[in-house]
Interface confidence: medium
C-alpha cells in the first residue's frame, strides 16, 4: 500500500495527500480545549483507471460498469487518531482518542 | 453507523449502496476457480453536506475548504471479505480470505 504526497506547489493531478492544518479556534469550536489546531491533511486529485486503487472491489465495479457507478474517487485509505481534550454535552472535560482525524494516505475507492 | 440501501428502481439521489453481482467468468478471469460470481455491491449517489459522513475529518476539511478539495464522495465505509479459491502467479492453487470484496455500507468521505 502506498499513496502520493503533494503540496500546494505540486503539479500532480492524480489522487494525492495534501497538507492541511485544521484550526478549531478559527472555526469557533471553543468546546475543544486542546489541541487548538492540528495537521489533518486531505485528499484531492483524479482517479484514473487502476491508479492507487485500495481494493480489488474498485477494479471489479469498474469492469462491471453498473448504471450510476461514478468511478472511484480520491478518498482517505489510511487514517489515524489524535488525542483531544474537550467538553462533552454535559460540560464534563473529556480526554480521549478521537479516531480518523488525520489522513495518512489517500487512494482511489 | 448506518447507510442507505437502494436498488435499480430507487429514486434516491443521495449516497446509497446498490446491488451488483460480479461475474468473474464474464470478465474472463479464469484464474479464479471459485466463486465464479458473487454479490459485491457498489456505492453511488450525491454527498450533500454532513449526509452520511463517516469521519469528523470529512466535516473539518469541508469547513477549512482548502484549494482543490472536491468535497466528500460516496464510497464504501464498511467492507467484508470473501473466501476464494484461485491460482497465484506461481500456478499454485490458493484458498484464502480476500479482504474488502463486498460493500456492506456506503457513506460520504
Amino acid at each position: 500500500d502506498f499513496g502520493l504526497d503533494c503540496d500546494e506547489h505540486s503539479t500532480e493531478s492524480r489522487c494525492c495527500r495534501y497538507p492541511l492544518t485544521v484550526d478549531f479556534e478559527a472555526f469557533g469550536w471553543d468546546w475543544i480545549i486542546a489541541p487548538k489546531r492540528y495537521k489533518a491533511n486531505y485528499c484531492s486529485g483524479e482517479c484514473e483507471f487502476v491508479f492507487l486503487q485500495k481494493y480489488p472491489h474498485t477494479h471489479l465495479v469498474h469492469q462491471a460498469n453498473p448504471r450510476g457507478s461514478a468511478g472511484p474517487c480520491c478518498t482517505p485509505t489510511k487514517m489515524s487518531p489524535i488525542n483531544m481534550l474537550y467538553f462533552n454535552g454535559k460540560e464534563q472535560i473529556i480526554y480521549g482518542k478521537i479516531p480518523a482525524m488525520v489522513v495518512d494516505r489517500c487512494g482511489c475507492s | 453507523d448506518f447507510g442507505l440501501d437502494c436498488d435499480e428502481h430507487s429514486t434516491e439521489s443521495r449516497c446509497c449502496r446498490y446491488p451488483l453481482t460480479v461475474d468473474f467468468e464474464a470478465f474472463g478471469w479464469d484464474w479464479i476457480i471459485a466463486p465464479k460470481r458473487y454479490k459485491a455491491n457498489y456505492c453511488s449517489g450525491e454527498c450533500e453536506f454532513v449526509f452520511l459522513q463517516k469521519y469528523p475529518h470529512t466535516h473539518l476539511v469541508h469547513q477549512a475548504n482548502p484549494r482543490g478539495s472536491a468535497g466528500p464522495c460516496c464510497t464504501p465505509t464498511k467492507m467484508s471479505p470473501i473466501n476464494m479459491l484461485y491460482f497465484n502467479g506461481k500456478e499454485q492453487i490458493i484458498y484464502g480470505k480476500i479482504p474488502a470484496m463486498v460493500v456492506d455500507r456506503c457513506g460520504c468521505s
Epitope: - | 471459485a34 470473501i82 476464494m84 484458498y95
Partner: antibody
Framework: QVQLVQSGAEVKKPGASVKVSCKAS????????MHWVRQAPGQGLEWIGN????????NYNQRFKARATLTTDTSTSTAYMELRSLRSDDTAVYYC?????????????????WGQGTLVTVSS | DIQMTQSPSSLSASVGDRVTITCKAS??????LSWFQQKPGKAPKTLIY???RLVDGVPSKFSGSGSGQDYTLTISSLQPEDFATYYC?????????FGQGTKLEIK
C-alpha cells in the same frame, strides 16, 4: 447449454496408445477443472485425474500417472486424455466430466456435466 | 487411498418401496460425498453432493445423510425409472475413489 462431446470408439492393439478428446461448449472452458473417469465393462467407476485448462495444472491417480497424460487446447475448448502402453484391462468407457464449484472450499464441488463416453477396446 | 465400501452390491425392490444404500469410507471424509445414478449405456448423473444436498432438478424422493465415515442414500418411493446402478464418490482427498456400486433391480 453446457455440453461435453467426446470422440468416437477406438480399437487398439496391446502396447499402442489412444488419445480421447472431449469438446466443451456453452461455458468458459478455461475456468473449470475437467476430470476423466473410466469404467471397465460391467465394472465400477475409476478416477483417472483432472486438469485445469487455464494453466494446464493437473492431478493424477497414481495408478495412471506413468501412462496417462491429460492436456487441453484452449483455442478449440477441447480436453484430451492419452493413455499409453495399452493392455487388455484398459478396455473401458472413458468419460470426461466438468467439476462445478458450488462453494469456495477446495472440495466444494460436484460433477454437473458428463461427456457421453468413449469406448476404447484393447484387443490383439 | 481412501476405500469406499458400498452395500448392498445388488438389491431387489418393488415400485413404491423405500430403499437405502450405504457407503462406508475407510477414514473420515468430512461429508465430501456424492451419489450418482447410472443407467445402462449412459454416463453417470449426480444426484446428491456434500452428503445431503440435492442437485437442482433431481426429485426430492432422493435424499442423502451421514457424516464422518458412514453415509446413506435413500429413495423414498421407487418408480420404474429409478431402477439403475448407484455409486458413491469421496472427494475429500486425491485420488478420488468410488464405491463399487449397487445395482437396484425390479423384484
Amino acid at each position: 447449454q453446457v455440453q461435453l462431446v467426446q470422440s468416437g470408439a477406438e480399437v487398439k492393439k496391446p502396447g499402442a496408445s489412444v488419445k480421447v478428446s472431449c469438446k466443451a461448449s456453452g461455458y468458459s472452458f478455461t475456468g473449470y477443472f475437467m476430470h476423466w473417469v473410466r469404467q471397465a465393462p460391467g465394472q465400477g467407476l475409476e478416477w483417472i485425474g483432472n486438469i485445469y485448462p487455464y494453466n494446464g495444472v493437473s492431478n493424477y491417480n497414481q495408478r495412471f500417472k506413468a501412462r496417462a497424460t491429460l492436456t487441453t487446447d484452449t483455442s478449440t475448448s477441447t480436453a484430451y486424455m492419452e493413455l499409453r502402453s495399452l493392455r487388455s484391462d484398459d478396455t473401458a468407457v472413458y468419460y470426461c466430466a466438468r467439476r462445478y464449484y458450488y462453494g469456495t472450499g477446495p472440495a466444494d464441488w460436484y460433477y454437473d456435466v458428463w461427456g457421453q463416453g468413449t469406448l476404447v477396446t484393447v484387443s490383439s | 487411498d481412501i476405500q469406499m465400501t458400498q452395500s448392498p452390491s445388488s438389491l431387489s425392490a418393488s415400485v413404491g418401496d423405500r430403499v437405502t444404500i450405504t457407503c462406508k469410507a475407510s477414514q473420515d471424509i468430512n461429508s465430501y460425498l456424492s451419489w450418482f445414478q447410472q443407467k445402462p449405456g449412459k454416463a453417470p448423473k449426480t444426484l446428491i453432493y456434500r452428503a445431503n444436498r440435492l442437485v437442482d432438478g433431481v426429485p426430492s424422493k432422493f435424499s442423502g445423510s451421514g457424516s464422518g465415515q458412514d453415509y446413506t442414500l435413500t429413495i423414498s418411493s421407487l418408480q420404474p425409472e429409478d431402477f439403475a446402478t448407484y455409486y458413491c464418490l469421496q472427494s475429500d482427498e486425491f485420488p478420488l475413489t468410488f464405491g463399487q456400486g449397487t445395482k437396484l433391480e425390479i423384484k
